[in-house]
């Protein structure tokens, strides 16, 4: 499956939108920063077969979509930007799902690298727990916004590596 160029553009649009969503200066939240232990090795496209890499990407985008679809998220962000951001993620999920279906037919390996999927889920659990512990404060959301920008940029790089493999 060739991930369409539009998918990569969608990811860039999502990053731009997320960048615009900030409501407070991140520099007022320096003390709130947190090490969420992003699972960097899961974004290294070299160690995966294509189907596994696509499933990691899908999980990453799905978890991001879930995080920004909560009531608490709706209260934190400007509604029109949040809707546009969610729409970009939803489109990416559709692209990836089509690829997952195609790749399963091509590769006879298991669809999911369970450890990698679990690592991504645990990463998002740490993010959710942080938000809960900080009572969804504006600074907590600002820290999470920067972290999701970081993870989206990792996934963009993984997509680039996948396209180079084609």
């Amino acid at each position: 499956c060739d991930l369409p160029q539009t998918h990569s553009l969608g990811n860039r649009r999502a990053l731009i939108l997320l960048g615009q969503m900030g409501r407070i200066s991140p520099f007022s939240c320096l003390k709130d920063r947190h090490d969420f232990r992003i699972p960097q090795e899961e974004f290294d496209g070299n160690q995966f077969q294509k189907a596994q890499a696509i499933s990691v990407l899908h999980e990453m985008i799905q978890q991001t979509f879930n995080l920004f679809s909560t009531e608490d998220s709706s209260a934190a962000w400007e509604q029109s930007l949040l809707e546009k951001f969610s729409t970009e993620l939803y489109q990416q999920l559709n692209d990836l799902e089509a690829c997952v279906i195609q790749e399963v037919g091509v590769e006879e390996t298991p669809l999911m690298n369970e450890d990698s999927i679990l690592a991504v889920r645990k990463y998002f659990q740490r993010i959710t727990l942080y938000l809960i512990e900080r009572k969804y404060s504006p600074c907590a959301w600002e820290v999470v916004r920067a972290e999701i920008m970081r993870s989206l940029s990792f996934s963009t790089n993984l997509q680039k590596r996948l396209r180079r493999k084609d």
């Epitope: 860039r12 960048g19 200066s25 320096l30 920063r33 947190h34 972290e147």
Partner: antibody, heavy 120, light 111 residues
């Protein structure tokens, strides 16, 4: 590849203002903070401030808040810094630098620097 | 403002030996798992180059002979084995709070 192209050498009189530019290419200009750093001849580095081109948000080192003004024009992929009420102390090389790794606030790519000389 | 004190101000190291540069912050720059201290190399007439971020993470493309360590207020940059091309001034920079500041620099000379 990422490049930051800064404007050339500037010679200015004390009391005047200067505006320097930093044209970015090779990356998404609107999604990275841009820092500005000062280096006086034979001396160390000083952080002036930072701008987010995506929305124009700025944060300054208090020492420079009345000296420097940071702006950006996204359509031109260019960041600007204006220095006002120039004195000899403002004679220095000024670098624009791209923020790295989001809220780690370190700097990966640097412009070649704009040399400002203040002299009567 | 957090003051970063680098030592020594200059040092001369023989080719192949170890260079150790220290950076001490007047206040902790570590919080919740990260140490917001970074290291740069600047050669004469050139722009600074990022070597290490978050105290110990080697920037992509930087040789493995460079390493960083430390947390809280005390940080170290090590270069081993030193090569001719490492002659430069090295700066630490923190991003723990505003304003971000740099150390005064350590000039490394190769003997």
């Amino acid at each position: 590849q990422v490049q930051l192209q800064e404007s050339g050498t500037v010679l200015a009189r004390p009391g005047a203002s200067v505006k320097m530019s930093c044209k970015a290419s090779g990356y998404s200009f609107t999604t990275y903070w841009m820092h500005w750093v000062k280096q006086r001849p034979g001396q160390g580095l000083e952080w002036i401030g930072v701008i987010y081109p995506g929305n124009g948000d700025t944060t300054y080192n208090q020492k420079f808040k009345d000296k420097a003004k940071l702006t950006a024009v996204t359509s031109a992929n260019t960041a600007y810094m204006e220095l006002s009420s120039l004195t000899n102390e403002d004679s220095a090389v000024y670098f624009c630098t791209r923020n790295y790794k989001y809220d780690y606030y370190t700097m990966d790519y640097w412009g070649q620097g704009t040399t400002v000389t203040v002299s009567s | 403002d957090i003051v970063l004190t680098q030592s020594p101000a200059s040092l001369a190291v023989s080719l192949g030996q170890r260079a150790t540069i220290s950076c001490r912050a007047s206040k902790s720059v570590s919080t919740s798992g990260h140490s917001y201290m970074h290291w740069y190399q600047q050669k004469p007439g050139q722009t600074p180059k990022l070597l290490i971020y978050l105290a110990s993470n080697l920037e992509s493309g930087v040789p493995a002979r460079f390493s960083g360590s430390g947390s809280g207020t005390d940080f170290t940059l090590n270069i081993h084995p030193v090569e001719e091309e490492d002659a430069a001034t090295y700066y630490c920079q923190h991003s723990g709070e505003l304003p971000f500041t740099f150390g005064s620099g350590t000039k490394l000379e190769i003997k």
